[in-house]
Interface confidence: medium
């Protein structure tokens, strides 16, 4: 059973599984970066447990995380972004487990937004566009995007298209006529930074026309 350690019970605490994972978000709030960590075991009793990051920081040796329910969080400008940091789970000032992590290799981009689909009658295609906050960023500018779409009735039959731009054309002949489609997009760092897929954008829904039908913009 997972529990927290009293001061005299550190030996017992070390038997627990305190493995954790983290992701960073760069320039997530102006020039501020964030780092979010959480235990992999959702049943870990996090009372009295703290996270601390040391090394590869500007101006300070270490920073403590804030606890927000079951996650641990830092927002700061002080990430050096070259070099490995030591992230430790601590109780009563003693480290229970630590990981050396380069924050540039655990970047999770912000989710794309403003996803929309416009039908072009003359071209018989659908132009998918979306936006990403990363176009304005200094660091994580180069992303690969994963556009996923499916016919609404086909719950698990997602089609995926990877692209580096924020515009995609879907040919009408590759879609079923008179069908409702759901489409969404997510992003992952490409080039210098590494990491994880962003959250999915909100889904956009559009209907394909009948053959030879010619509506304008698809309404969600």
């Amino acid at each position: 059973e997972s529990g927290y350690a009293q001061n005299g019970d550190l030996e017992d605490a070390e038997l627990d599984d305190y493995s954790f994972s983290c992701y960073s978000q760069l320039e997530v709030n102006g020039s501020q970066h964030s780092l979010t960590c959480a235990f992999e075991d959702p049943d870990v009793n996090t009372t009295n447990l703290e996270f601390e990051i040391c090394g590869a920081l500007v101006e300070v040796k270490c920073l403590s995380f804030r606890k927000l329910q079951e996650i641990y969080f830092i927002e700061t400008k002080k990430f050096l972004l070259i070099g490995k940091s030591n992230i430790c789970v601590k109780v009563g000032g003693k480290s229970l487990t630590c990981k050396k992590i380069d924050l540039t290799t655990i970047v999770k981009p912000e989710a794309p937004f403003d996803l929309s689909v416009i039908y072009r009658e003359g071209a018989n295609d659908f132009v998918v566009t979306f936006n990403t906050s990363h176009l304005q960023k200094k660091y994580v500018k180069v992303l690969m995007h994963d556009v996923a779409y499916r016919q609404e009735k086909d719950e698990n039959k997602w089609m995926h298209v990877n692209l580096s731009s924020t515009k995609l054309t879907l040919l009408q002949r590759n879609l079923q006529p008179e069908a409702m489609y759901e489409i969404k997009v997510r992003s992952i760092p490409d080039h210098y930074f590494k990491g994880f897929w962003s959250e999915w954008s909100p889904s956009y829904y559009f209907r394909t026309p009948e053959i030879n039908n010619s509506p304008g913009e698809m309404d969600p």
């Epitope: 500007v58 050096l80 070259i82 070099g83 050396k100 380069d102």
Partner: antibody
Framework: EVQLVESGGGLVQPGRSLRLSCAAS????????MHWVRQAPGKGLEWVSG????????GYADSVKGRFTIFRDNAKNSLYLQMNSLRAEDTALYYC??????????????WGQGTTVTVSS | AIQLTQSPSSLSASVGDRVTITCRAS??????LAWYQQKPGKAPKLLIY???SLESGVPSRFSGSGSGTDFTLTISSLQPEDFATYYC???????????FGQGTRLEIK
């Protein structure tokens, strides 16, 4: 004991190439960025190039950009500087240096004794 | 790139003197500055990092101060072994870039 030992310097004609090596020991090499710093005779320190622990972050001084290439082999605990199209003004003592980012930001806390490069016809 | 300008370029002082060397950055660098000492024929040695933190093993007569653009290295009471050249150093993390000041030569008067 933490140690950096440079090698590969020598006398070379202008326009030719040379490769410097730096053998590291006594610390976890692949936790640290590494740098080359040079010092021309009677002059000050000039940073030449730096490389992050995983080789994804690389920088060069303007004076060597396009001519010098920094690379590392973490399996061999070694840092290298490939110097092409050498010029007389590249004549200097070349130091290999280890960064120590746990100090709060990049500082060069361990230096080798240097290897001399002389470019002359 | 950010430029670092040290002053004076050289100075003469006597054992026991209090000595101050300044380093000015062409733009604000917070406290991201280090100081090194170099003796003839030797590799540089780290003295101060993070503008004011003393490196382990460095005598307490050395101190650093400053933030933003203006930084100071002070030797409170000069010892014979302190006669050397001193350099300030700044970094930029993206892209990886380091800049040194031009150096200050401290000589015996």
């Amino acid at each position: 004991e933490v140690q950096l030992v440079e090698s590969g310097g020598g006398l070379v004609q202008p326009g030719r190439s040379l490769r410097l090596s730096c053998a590291a020991s006594g610390f976890t090499f692949d936790d640290h960025a590494m740098h080359w710093v040079r010092q021309a005779p009677g002059k000050g320190l000039e940073w030449v190039s730096g490389i992050s622990w995983n080789s994804r972050g690389i920088g060069y001084a303007d004076s060597v950009k396009g001519r010098f290439t920094i690379f590392r082999d973490n399996a061999k605990n070694s840092l290298y500087l490939q110097m092409n199209s050498l010029r007389a003004e590249d004549t200097a003592l070349y130091y290999c240096a280890k960064d120590e980012y746990s100090r709060g930001y990049y500082v060069l806390d361990v230096w080798g004794q240097g290897t001399t490069v002389t470019v002359s016809s | 790139a950010i430029q670092l300008t040290q002053s004076p370029s050289s100075l003469s002082a006597s054992v026991g003197d209090r000595v101050t060397i300044t380093c000015r950055a062409s733009q604000g660098i917070s406290s991201a500055l280090a100081w090194y000492q170099q003796k003839p024929g030797k590799a540089p040695k780290l003295l101060i990092y993070d503008a004011s933190s003393l490196e382990s093993g460095v005598p307490s007569r050395f101190s650093g101060s400053g933030s933003g653009t203006d930084f100071t290295l002070t030797i409170s009471s000069l010892q014979p072994e302190d006669f050397a050249t001193y350099y300030c150093q700044q970094f930029n993390s993206y892209p990886l870039w380091i800049t040194f000041g031009q150096g200050t030569r401290l000589e015996i008067k």
